[in-house]
């Protein structure tokens, strides 16, 4: 599997809603015995590796899992809506988090993590990451703008 990010930078004015997306590309046949654990978290650009430090998004830790044969099934979890968040996963491999009514404090590096679990053992940890910049003031745009990554930045980070 591979995790890609369609956009690497989102620039939003305060008060807008923004949907950050990772795409899980799964080339293995649907019958393969593997599950995925998935989460979103805030991180920082570490000296060695991005997405290594984990911080909850708006004090919320998301938990999702699905099986290759039932890709759209999510684990139940503490209602993200209470935190102004929506987390979604569709049959096309899009794993997204929507932040409602963004504020300056939502700015930061957002990471999606996908853990491939085979026969109960975590095989691989794959990350995608993107920056959210929330802007204030009269000079900022009225809607969010998303910028695609450079070619060399578009692939996921893999940690065995």
């Amino acid at each position: 599997i591979k995790v890609t990010t369609p956009y690497s930078l989102y620039v939003c004015p305060e008060g807008q809603n923004v949907t950050l997306t990772c795409r899980i590309l799964d080339s293995v046949s649907k019958g393969h015995d593997a599950n995925f654990l998935k989460t979103w978290f805030l991180s920082s650009r570490g000296e060695v590796q991005v997405c290594k430090e984990h911080r909850p998004i708006r004090n919320f830790i998301s938990h999702h899992q699905h099986h290759r044969s039932h890709p759209a099934v999510n684990a139940s979890h503490d209602q993200p809506q209470k935190h102004g968040l929506e987390i979604a996963y569709d049959n096309h491999g899009n794993f997204s988090i929507t932040l409602h009514n963004v504020t300056l404090s939502d700015s930061g590096l957002y990471c999606c993590l996908v853990i491939e679990v085979k026969h109960h053992h975590p095989e691989r940890r794959l990350y995608g990451y993107m920056e959210l910049q929330v802007q204030t003031g009269k000079g900022s745009a009225s809607t969010c703008t998303a910028y695609p990554p450079n070619e060399q930045d578009s692939d996921s980070i893999t940690a065995a």
Partner: antibody, heavy 119, light 107 residues
Amino acid sequence: QVQLQESGPGLVKPSDTLSLTCTVSGYSITSDYTWNWIRQTPGKGLEWIGHITYSGSVSYNPSLRSRVTISRDTSKNQFSLKLSSVTAADTATYSCARALYYPWYFDVWGTGTTVTVSS
Amino acid sequence: EIVLTQSPATLSLSPGERATLSCRASSSVGYIHWYQQKPGQAPRPLIYATSYRATGIPARFSGSGSGTDNTLTISSLEPEDSAVYYCQQWSSYPPITFGGGTKLEVK
């Protein structure tokens, strides 16, 4: 093979500070993971005290935050717990444990050390 | 904080029987982890992320559930399964919380 071993005094006087150290072998505490302190009492069961991450940031149980300090000595591959103003209610078996950031479970534990608070 | 309530507090069964241990959360959680603790030993990870067996755990142990209700099942009990079993959550953090434990006797 990763091993964690707690050490420190088994008896602490009321109002004093409890100090324990966890020595980690087989893995560098600066490489990854969160490094946790957990205590166990017959009355309250297992209680998470707090942790220090591989990068040195800390998080504490809100119920103990005002009395707890977790620090580390990277040169010795150790992390430590200090709990101030102890009372008899702090008598417990204290364990250190390692947890990966996600999916957040304790995969390696120390054997635990019993601390009694008594004059 | 999220409170985890385990039931029953104690359970006494015979070898070969099926054990069902419950862990109920005070509000919805993502994953529950299960640990086994024998007298004088540290807790041992049993099930992580609700349903995945930790390294070296036999297939007779299984976990299931979601939201507020989670279950640890031991399909065919062995005498060595006598222990205290704890559930744990890390969805609401801090603090990480544990259940009060279920003491299982196999005799």
